[in-house]
Amino acid sequence: GSERTCCPVNWVEHERSCYWFSRSGKAWADADNYCRLEDAHLVVVTSWEEQKFVQHHIGPVNTWMGLHDQNGPWKWVDGTDYETGFKNWRPEQPDDWYGHGLGGGEDCAHFTDDGRWNDDVCQRPYRWVCETELDKASQEPPLL
């Protein structure tokens, strides 16, 4: 079958998920497409533990995550509920800042140099992190 029980080559396993860390930059949409073609999605941060893990691997570099607010409320790409979930915004963020001169506000979230989150223009070429969950069924004991 297509069940994934271990991480692909060059991916890092952590807490039953696999992570891939880019070393180049892409616009958010291109990063998102890249992850989907790998059967994954842009990273969805659900806990402080996961935040620390990702932060450790990306270092002090602006890096896209799978969070956007293009259609109103903030949304995680995998459907994880934003309102009740983990958040780690920088103080006074997100601010949908128009002062960058591009106009139109900021609709995609990224890790900043200190790991906390900021909203920014989606077409900026930042690094990104893909995540895919190891098959949950493989955690269950075999049926007798």
């Epitope: 949409a29 497409n33 790409v77 591009l102 506000g105 609709d107 223009v121 077409q123």
Partner: antibody, heavy 119, light 106 residues
Framework: QVQLVESGGGVVQPGRSLRLSCAAS????????MHWVRQAPGKGLEWVAV????????YYADSVKGRFTISRDNSKNTLYLQMNSLRAEDTAVYYC????????????WGQGTLVTVSS | SYELTQPLSVSVALGQTARITCGGD??????VHWYQQKPGQAPVLVIY???NRPSGIPERFSGSNSGNTATLTISRAQAGDEADYYC?????????FGGGTKLTVL
């Protein structure tokens, strides 16, 4: 509200050139990638070209590569499509469309301008 | 190049549910978007990124994507839903549309 208005269409002979324009209003034009999409009479939609919000990247469909050039003037809130070496198969309604930036889709479209290539 | 396959036509009885499919190799790995086009009008985005509805689009419109098929579902079909519907993806820096499906509401 968001408005996209195409102009510049008309009847042109094969091998000749035409430049289409798309005037944008109601949003900050300089923030968005923009596309041209065309539709031949009675046929389906065909993507033509895209240009990044700052003009830094441009991509084209194979069918127009080397003949069409997409450009923009953010100071004039206008998108352009320069069409050279036109062929009969380029006959279509040409739409400009705005890209939201979240996966290359088109949330607002103009009403289109008809280009007819005929001798 | 990537290809998207749609049925030429789909019919649905008034008030019933219409399903329009869009086939592509491992399409689940791609963001699929759907447009509605009525005669003489420009297309309108009805679903983006597989299942998201733009503001102003009725909840009757929904989308899904798995395996080799993406599906646009229109529940409680109305006469005003009669139109052509196109799926679309992005592949290798190129926009790709399906051939379109004519929805007829009986």
């Amino acid at each position: 509200q968001v408005q996209l208005v195409e102009s510049g269409g008309g009847v042109v002979q094969p091998g000749r050139s035409l430049r289409l324009s798309c005037a944008a209003s109601g949003f900050t034009f300089s923030s968005y990638a923009m596309h041209w999409v065309r539709q031949a009479p009675g046929k389906g939609l065909e993507w033509v070209a895209v240009i990044w919000y700052d003009g830094s990247n441009k991509y084209y469909a194979d069918s127009v590569k080397g003949r069409f050039t997409i450009s923009r003037d953010n100071s004039k809130n206008t998108l352009y499509l320069q069409m050279n070496s036109l062929r009969a198969e380029d006959t279509a309604v040409y739409y400009c469309a705005r890209d939201l930036g979240l996966g290359y889709f088109f949330d607002y479209w103009g009403q289109g301008t008809l280009v007819t290539v005929s001798s | 190049s990537y290809e998207l396959t749609q049925p030429l036509s789909v019919s649905v009885a008034l008030g019933q549910t219409a399903r329009i499919t869009c086939g592509g190799d491992n399409i689940r790995r791609r963001n699929v978007h759907w447009y509605q086009q009525k005669p003489g009008q420009a297309p309108v985005l009805v679903i983006y990124r597989d299942s998201n509805r733009p503001s102003g689009i009725p909840e009757r419109f929904s989308g899904s994507n798995s395996g080799n098929t993406a599906t646009l579902t229109i529940s409680r079909a109305q006469a005003g839903d009669e139109a052509d519907y196109y799926c679309q993806v992005w592949d290798s820096s190129t926009g790709v549309f399906g051939g379109g499906t004519k929805l007829t509401v009986l």
